[in-house]
Every structure is written in C-alpha cells, then in structure tokens.
Interface confidence: medium
C-alpha cells in the first residue's frame, strides 16, 4: 500500500486515465502560507488558457498529475489531436483515437 | 535530443542521505509528470517516486515511506530525490523517467525517457 | 499492492524462432473507463530500461513490429515473432492502473 500523508486535503482526485479503483495516496506540498490558498478548488485550465487548445477532441485535466491533455475524435492524434490518421483501424491502432 | 542525466550518487554510511538530482534537456519538462525508478544489483525494477507536473502531488510506496522525498524546479529542468534515514536494502543504480507522453487521447503509456541511471551504495 | 507475475523468469530461443513471455497480475488492470494500463519495457544489458509496449498493445516508437502485445484483465502476454541478436536482455511488465505502480520479475531473453 501507499502511505497517505495529506499536508491539506486535496479534492477528491480521478487517478490513472481519470479513474482507477485504488486512489493514490499523496502528499500534497504547501505549508501554513499556502494552506487557504491552496483548500480553494484549483481552476480547471481546460476552462481557461486550454479552452480552445484540442482541435478535434476535448480536453481533459488530470488533476493529480496536473497535466492537460486531449482526448481525441476517432481518426485524429497528436497532442493536439489535429493530425488525421491515414490508416485505416486495425487492432494495433484503434486504441490511438479511442 | 530528449535526455535525462542523473548525478549526485555514491557510497553512504547507514542511516546517512544523498541528494540525486536529474537534469532534463530536450523537452518542455514541465508539461510532464516524473518518476524515479531504482534497481538493487542483479535485481528487477521498482517505483521509487513519482511528482506532477507543478509539483504539488508527490506519491511514494511505502518502502520508501518518509525517508524520502521527491522534488522538481521547472525553471531548472529539473527533478530531485532526497534520500534520509538510507539502509543497505536502498543500495540500487537510481533512474529518472518521464511519463508520458501525454497525448493519443489518454495521457499515461508508461515511463517513455530514462535517463542513464546513478550508483548510490549503502554500506558500512 | 497488485503483484505483477512473469514467466517463465529464464527463456532461452533460437535465432528467428517466436518468444512469448506471459504476465499475470493478482487484480484487475482494467479501470473505471475500461483502460489497462499494462506496459512492457525491455532492458539491454548494461543498459537502461526502454518502453516497448504500453497500455497491453500499442508498440511505441520506434518498436519493431515483431513485438506484439496481447491479453486483458489479469493475463497479458508479450510476443516476439523472430527473435533477433539485439533482442537479448530482461523483459518487464508494469502496470500503473494502480498506485503503488509495480513490475514483474522481469524474463531474461538469451539466445540458444
């Protein structure tokens, strides 16, 4: 198991591709001077500065990597999900633009 | 090139800390989460640490519980383990990795960099 | 912590001939939205490790396609179609569905 060692308690967090059985068990940084700043729900930046970043696809924060990313529409990929796949779906494949 | 380059291994009595350090070129290190990865001689691999991006997650299993910790400076490129209270079972060559990459629709496909790895021994 | 199983931990192949390595987990490495987060990574000797499959069967970059993945839930199986020379090293599965993040043994692939 994983040690849970909360310095504040974060929001309830999705882990591996946004959910997972087991919730990671972490120790969050920040001491006094940042405990009321950081009790406040963090901004989702695919609400802000990444509204319009996936082309063709949504975007998604995961929040307890604090990482942004694209889910993509069937047939596109890339980071932004803007470039369209010339191949057709083979079994190798099909899971890039699930 | 992506490349991390860890430092800061060596020869520790028990019960003394070390500093690793992993200095990261070649990508925008702070878009990814990182992870440290060790490996005891003639062993398998196991999960050290991982932090997220900005640095506010930090996770660790519990063989490592409260001795160390796990730190990054993205203006620096780079990522830290503070290692305390070491023992001889901690005697390992030390890698950094990168998770990611984070696109393709699901941001986690594993540890895609490693860097070279650093020696640290624990020994009287 | 999910217990990641490998065998066989020793497999010894003949040039051009297939290799399978099989990977049991003690849970399931399916999430709540259907993805499995079971990835191989091949380790050379004296080198460091590289990602060679992820999420059961995806071939990463650069990945010849003679590695192929398969399996799901608990049971996953990495395949070599025609081993070759360079192909020598130890073979481990990981999964990062859950935290703690764990790998196998590890399965040392020699030539004959």
């Known amino acids: 198991s994983v040690r849970v060692e909360q310095v504040v308690k974060p929001p309830q967090n999705k882990t591996e591709s946004e959910n997972t059985s087991d919730k990671p068990k972490r120790k969050k940084k920040g001491g006094k001077n940042g405990k009321n700043r950081r009790n406040r729900k963090k901004k989702n930046p695919c609400n802000a500065e990444f509204q319009n970043f996936c082309i063709h696809g949504e975007c998604k924060y995961i929040e307890h990597l604090e990482a942004v990313t694209c889910k993509c529409q069937q047939e596109y990929f890339g980071e932004r999900c803007g470039e369209k796949s010339m191949k057709t779906h083979s079994m190798i494949d099909s899971s890039l633009s699930k | 090139e992506v490349q991390l380059v860890e430092s800061g291994g060596g020869l520790v009595k028990p019960g003394g800390s070390l500093r690793l350090s992993c200095a990261a070129s070649?990508?925008?290190?702070?878009?990814?989460?990182m992870s440290w990865v060790r490996q005891a001689p003639e062993k398998g691999l196991e999960w050290v640490s991982t932090?997220?991006?900005?640095?506010?997650?930090?996770y660790y299993p519990d063989s490592v519980k409260g001795r160390f910790t796990i730190s990054r400076d993205n203006a620096k490129n780079s990522l830290y383990l503070q290692m305390n209270s070491l023992r001889a079972e901690d005697t390992a060559v030390y890698y950094c990795?990168?998770?990611?990459?984070?696109?393709?629709?699901?941001?986690?496909?594993?540890?895609?960099?490693w860097g070279q790895g650093t020696t640290v021994t624990v020994s009287s | 912590d999910v217990v990641m199983t490998q065998s066989p931990l020793s497999l010894p192949v003949t040039l051009g001939d297939p290799a399978s390595i099989s990977c049991r987990s003690s849970?399931?490495?399916?999430?709540?939205?259907?993805?499995?987060?079971l990835h191989w990574y091949q380790q050379r000797p004296g080198q460091s490790p590289k990602l060679l499959i992820y999420?059961?069967?995806n071939r990463f970059d650069g990945v010849p396609d003679r590695f192929s993945g398969s399996g799901s839930g608990t049971d996953f199986t990495l395949k070599i179609s025609r081993v070759e020379a360079e192909d020598v090293g130890v073979y481990y599965c990981?999964?990062?569905?859950?935290?703690?993040?764990?790998f196998g043994q590890g399965t040392k692939l020699e030539i004959k």
């Open positions: 849970q399931s490495l399916v999430n709540q939205e259907g993805e499995t987060y």
């Open positions: 990981s999964q990062s569905t859950h935290v703690p993040y764990t």
């Open positions: 070649g990508f925008t290190f702070s878009s990814y989460p």
């Open positions: 932090i997220s991006t900005g640095g506010t997650y930090t």
């Open positions: 990795a990168r998770q990611g990459p984070i696109y393709y629709g699901n941001y986690y496909y594993g540890m895609d960099v």
């Open positions: 999420k059961v069967s």
